[in-house]
């Protein structure tokens, strides 16, 4: 721990009525917990690659930053935060890379100031539903979250639930309605397949949504309408084949949008014509310069905004007696 | 060990300003806030500020705003105080003192500058 | 601001004898933002007792802290030579920190 435990002041006669003495003056007790370094001036405690196997209970009541990454937590049990007096500063909370595989409901309570969580890199199993809301009621206490970071927090195939994985996060976004006031959610490098099809109409504060290094196919359930104050939309790097008119009508009624398409393996067939023409027209898509096709094989590495409707054809649907094998 | 510095004590005139300095050392000085106390001959200890070396945030008690600027060079590890507009009700000794929020107490001294205002 | 009165200003006291001074805040403060300092002659203030109750390492065992809310007490339970000085509190409820007038304590 940081603070120092030596102890000495000098005071001199530089004051012409105080006599030379050595002051031996006892330092206070360091409020530093174990295998962690802590900042009073940057309010902040870090206890980083410590293999703690749970969250100190002798935190200061003034951290406002506690990194907690590269750890071995595996549980955050309810109240994992809870403290008396409470860590009524704490703001930013870094839990990446310490091999967290379930958070229980409730983990994140008493944490009134709490405003950018961070749980990337952890093998979530088992998310509970009421894990950012606290309580299982249908609406519930409004949660002071503005950032939520979760980004590959997916567990390996075998060790996944009986369940939808994105179905798990979703119920953690939704619970309670409590993260109404979220502005930036990072869920990227989880192997999304779809997004189910509430999330985002729930979340009406978004800023920031960053869904890259997913497997995204489709967006045709996704609504963006209510999305109001969205700024910048992460798709890079899915499996997006082509963005369809009603999702490109929303994406351009968004008024502060930029959107990143960059790494799909675009299909440029006829139903790209659409978007083939959005592109041309539309600011919101940053480097849009550099999307290419990635299907039909002929297509291959073309620029999309190179290409005319001519180049956009679908092969004619044989009637079965046609088809060769 | 923990050590605060202060510089030699001054003999001003009526309004002029002094600046006296605080070197600290044997702990990470921007790790700290650090505090300066006002000591009147026979008079209680006058809290008058606190700099967060960090952020650079200053916190002035209202009775001081005015009177005391303080300063830090981080490259030094060195805190400044200036009293500008001096009277013979500003004499007396200043300390810094570092501040330690866990408990908003102070914990390490330094050993006073002497600051007498005479014409 | 959260003024503290300390009485008495001064007390003299007997070798061996209890003595109690106390401090008293116009607000009510934290147990664990109320703090003593003991500060002899010439010397800069040492913190003596901090959250109210707990002893700065090498304080000797005789003194003793208590109080809650707005009012709170040093205690020494037998009183030495080397306790003469002068003792402060200061509290922290929100800035400005504040502190007390002061007790000299005497031996007699």
């Known amino acids: 721990s940081s603070s120092p435990t030596s102890s000495a002041s000098s005071f001199s006669s530089s004051a012409p009525f105080l006599a030379s003495a050595v002051s031996a003056q006892p330092p206070l007790p360091d409020q530093c917990p174990a295998l962690c370094e802590c900042s009073e001036a940057a309010r902040t405690v870090k206890c980083v690659n410590r293999n703690l196997t749970e969250v100190p209970t002798d935190l200061p009541a003034y951290v406002r930053n506690l990194f907690l990454t590269g750890n071995q937590l595996a549980v955050l049990p309810a109240g994992a935060f809870a403290r008396r007096p409470p860590l009524a500063e704490l703001a930013a909370l870094n839990l990446s890379g310490s091999r967290l595989d379930e958070v229980r409901a409730g983990a994140f309570e008493h944490l009134p100031s709490l405003r950018q969580l961070d749980l990337s890199h952890n093998p979530l199993a088992d998310l509970s539903p009421f894990a950012f809301s606290g309580s299982n009621a249908s609406v519930s206490a409004p949660s002071p979250l503005v950032e939520l970071i979760l980004n590959h927090i997916v567990p390996p195939e075998d060790e996944r639930q009986n369940r939808s994985f994105e179905g798990m996060v979703v119920a953690a976004l939704l619970a309670g309605r409590a993260l109404q006031g979220l502005r930036r959610l990072e869920l990227a490098s989880n192997h999304f397949l779809y997004l189910p099809r509430d999330v985002l109409a729930q979340l009406p504060s978004l800023r920031h949504l960053d869904l890259s290094n997913n497997s995204l196919v489709s967006l045709t359930y996704v609504s963006f309408r209510n999305l109001t104050h969205l700024e910048s939309l992460h798709l890079e790097d899915n499996a997006l084949k082509v963005l369809h008119n009603g999702t490109l009508a929303e994406l351009q009624g968004l008024p502060h949008i930029r959107v990143f398409l960059d790494n799909n393996p675009w299909v440029c067939d006829c139903h790209m014509a659409d978007m083939v023409t959005w592109l041309k027209e539309t600011e919101v898509v940053q480097g849009k310069d550099r999307l290419t096709c990635a299907y039909p094989e002929k297509m291959r590495n073309r620029v999309l905004l190179e290409l005319n409707s001519a180049d956009l054809d679908c092969d004619p649907i044989l009637p079965p007696s046609l088809q060769t094998s | 060990e923990v050590q605060l510095q202060q510089s030699g004590p001054v003999l001003v005139k009526p309004g002029a300003s002094v600046k006296m300095s605080c070197e600290a050392s044997?702990?990470?000085?921007?790790?700290?806030?650090m505090s300066w106390v006002k000591q009147s001959r026979g008079r209680s200890l006058e809290w008058i500020g606190v700099f967060n070396p960090y952020s650079g945030e200053i916190i002035y008690n209202q009775k001081f705003k005015g009177k005391a600027t303080l300063t830090v060079d981080k490259s030094s590890s060195t805190a400044y105080m200036e009293l500008s507009s001096l009277t013979s009700e500003d004499s007396g000794v200043y300390s810094c003192a570092r501040l330690r929020i866990s408990y908003y107490a102070i914990d390490y001294w330094g050993q006073g500058t002497s600051v007498a205002v005479s014409s | 601001e959260n003024v503290l009165t300390q009485s008495p200003a001064i007390m003299s006291a007997s070798p061996g004898e209890k003595v109690t001074m106390t401090c008293r805040a116009t607000s009510s403060v934290s147990s664990g933002h109320f703090h003593w300092y003991q500060q002899k002659s010439g010397a800069s203030p040492k913190v003596w007792i901090y959250?109210?109750?707990n002893l700065a390492s090498g304080v000797p065992a005789r003194f003793s802290g208590s109080g809650s809310g707005t009012s709170f007490s040093l205690t020494i339970s037998s009183v030495e030579a080397e306790d003469v000085a002068t003792y402060f509190c200061?509290?922290?409820?929100?800035?400005?920190?504040?502190f007390g007038g002061g007790t000299k304590l005497e031996i007699k």
């Open positions: 044997g702990y990470s000085f921007i790790d700290y806030y």
């Open positions: 200061q509290q922290y409820s929100g800035y400005p920190l504040t």
């Open positions: 959250s109210t109750s």
